[in-house]
């Protein structure tokens, strides 16, 4: 922590300007009034402060606003945002997309994924839901940031907004997030024709249940292997060899390369070897011919 000293009269600060870059840390601490700093935050980013000096300024703001900064200050943080921790950001209430844009631009090129995720979370909370304008801002200024939101926050996305989401925005989404987004996407695209529907729904399919995947296999969609590999393991395991063949079309040839990877490996183990052989790829590990499969979990459930 910075030592408390009194400010020499000749160093007294009446406005935030470039002369402050020559102040030592303890001089900044003693001479800069926190309220003045807050009022003139829009000037800070234009001044080439060192990281050490920024630490002092942050300390000032923390003392002035122990419950979290007001949005008027947050909007003008500029490079001071790089000094914020997720704990700091969690105290904020942000509703303006201009604030979000400004801080996303500052964070670009810096390892700030935790801070950005927390910031986006605060924006969603502040605005009440993940509306179209917020989604548009995220896709434009922070591709992939949508997936930094928790499933709980994503549940506030109205289906009407799903159309604004691009495939690359979902690249880093996990299964739990896709579980939330998939039903919304299904609803959003329900009136589209077969091929158009598949193009739109494809990025969300990591959240699809088995019955929907089975339904797709009847529609000549020719699902690419990358999409198939992102399907939920639980959605893939009940599929028959015939269903996978119809689902993938010519892409089924790629199963050989993925033979040792989940969910293909797990799926292979549940198929009859005879059926796997019909794929013409030499896939191994299926249930040998003549073996009977007993599902003991069913018996346990009954006892």
């Amino acid at each position: 922590d910075v030592e408390r000293t009194t400010c020499p009269p000749e160093k007294e600060v009446h406005e935030i300007d470039e002369s402050l870059i020559f102040y030592k840390k303890r001089e900044l601490e003693a001479c800069v009034d926190a309220a003045l700093l807050a009022a003139q935050m829009d000037r800070v980013d234009a001044i080439p402060f060192t990281y050490e000096q920024l630490d002092v300024l942050k300390h000032k703001l923390d003392e002035l606003y122990p419950q979290g900064y007001p949005e008027s200050v947050i909007r003008h943080l500029g490079h001071l945002f790089l000094k914020m921790s997720p704990e700091d950001i969690r105290k904020w209430n942000v509703t303006s997309l201009e604030t979000l844009k400004a801080l996303l631009k500052v964070s670009k090129g810096h390892e700030m994924s935790a801070q950005v995720a927390t910031l986006i979370d605060r924006v969603v909370v502040g605005r009440g839901q993940l509306d179209k304008d917020t989604v548009d801002t995220l896709t434009a200024f922070c591709p992939g940031c949508l997936c930094s939101l928790s499933p709980e926050r994503l549940s506030s996305v109205p289906p009407s907004v799903i159309g604004a989401v691009r495939p690359q925005d979902l690249d880093t989404c996990g299964p739990r997030q896709l579980d939330v987004l998939y039903p919304k996407a299904r609803l959003a695209f329900q009136n589209m024709s077969g091929s158009e529907y598949f193009v739109k729904i494809r990025p969300f399919l990591g959240g699809a249940p088995t019955e929907d995947v089975k339904a797709l296999s009847q529609q000549n969609v020719s699902m690419d292997l990358a999409t198939f590999m992102k399907l939920r393991r639980e959605a893939v395991l009940p599929l028959t060899v015939a269903e996978v063949q119809k689902l993938l079309g010519p892409h089924v040839e790629g199963l050989k390369v993925e033979e040792q990877h989940s969910p293909v490996r797990d799926w292979i183990l549940k198929q009859r070897q005879d059926d796997l052989d019909t794929l013409g790829l030499g896939l191994q590990g299926g249930i040998p011919n003549g073996y009977l499969i007993l599902d003991l979990s069913v018996r346990e459930a009954l006892s």
């Epitope: 690419d224 040839e253 050989k256 052989d277 019909t278 794929l279 013409g280 030499g282």
Partner: antibody
Framework: EVQLVQSGAEVKKPGASVKVSCKAS????????MHWVRQAPGQGLEWMGN????????YYNERFRSRVTMTVDKSTSTAYMELSSLRSEDTAVYYC??????????????WGQGTTVTVSS | DIQMTQSPSSLSASVGDRVTITCKAS??????IAWYQHKPGKAPKLLIH???ELQPGVPSRFSGSGSGRDYTFTISSLQPEDIATYYC?????????FGGGTKVEIK
């Protein structure tokens, strides 16, 4: 040693059909799909389609879909490619090729020697 | 379908010259590209797969590089036996496509 041996050269009249064979040996025939590629004089290589040798399911290049038929005879480890309604532009060398599934959908590491088909009236 | 645009369509170089051929895919092919040498009356010969992996027995003067949509094939020092047509093949999609070919001649 993996070998793909194709049938001999053919001369056909426009409108006729031609059936080229490709006999595989040195590997398990039903473990690799068979592909067909052609090269017309002065033109580049063109992928025509492929066939699953285990269930006989083919996938064709859209350009040939209406005229090509790919089949297999598992008992003799032979793949066939039949092209109908021949025209002079179908004059080409036709190759069968086997993929190696090292990455993605596989690249071709073994090729037949090629079958020259000449379409002339 | 993925289109492969290969250039130049032909080139003439002296023995010992460095020769470069490029292939541009219509979309990202994730390095799934192979290069073939094709001589008249013979079957195409695989030289390189997965952008830069040299096939066993292929001379080290042949090399490949690239990523995304742009790929390059290089012969570091052209030899008389390298006279042939060279093709790229994308196998990122099951419906394979070849480049148009580059005919390499000796000056």
């Amino acid at each position: 040693e993996v070998q793909l041996v194709q049938s001999g050269a053919e001369v056909k009249k426009p409108g006729a059909s031609v059936k080229v064979s490709c006999k595989a040996s040195g590997y398990t025939f039903t473990n690799y799909w068979m592909h067909w590629v052609r090269q017309a004089p002065g033109q580049g290589l063109e992928w025509m389609g492929n066939i699953n040798p285990s269930n006989g399911g083919p996938y064709y290049n859209e350009r040939f879909r209406s005229r090509v038929t790919m089949t297999v005879d598992k008992s003799t480890s032979t793949a066939y490619m039949e092209l109908s309604s021949l025209r002079s532009e179908d004059t080409a060398v036709y190759y069968c090729a086997r993929p190696y599934y090292g990455s993605s959908y596989g690249y071709f590491d073994y090729w037949g020697q090629g079958t020259t088909v000449t379409v002339s009236s | 379908d993925i289109q492969m645009t290969q250039s130049p369509s032909s080139l003439s170089a002296s023995v010992g010259d460095r020769v470069t051929i490029t292939c541009k895919a219509s979309q990202d092919i994730n390095k799934y590209i192979a290069w073939y040498q094709h001589k008249p009356g013979k079957a195409p010969k695989l030289l390189i797969h997965y952008t830069s992996e040299l096939q066993p027995g292929v001379p080290s003067r042949f090399s490949g590089s690239g990523s995304g949509r742009d790929y390059t094939f290089t012969i570091s020092s052209l030899q008389p036996e390298d006279i042939a047509t060279y093709y790229c093949l994308q196998y990122a999609n099951p419906l394979r496509t070849f480049g148009g070919g580059t005919k390499v001649e000796i000056k």
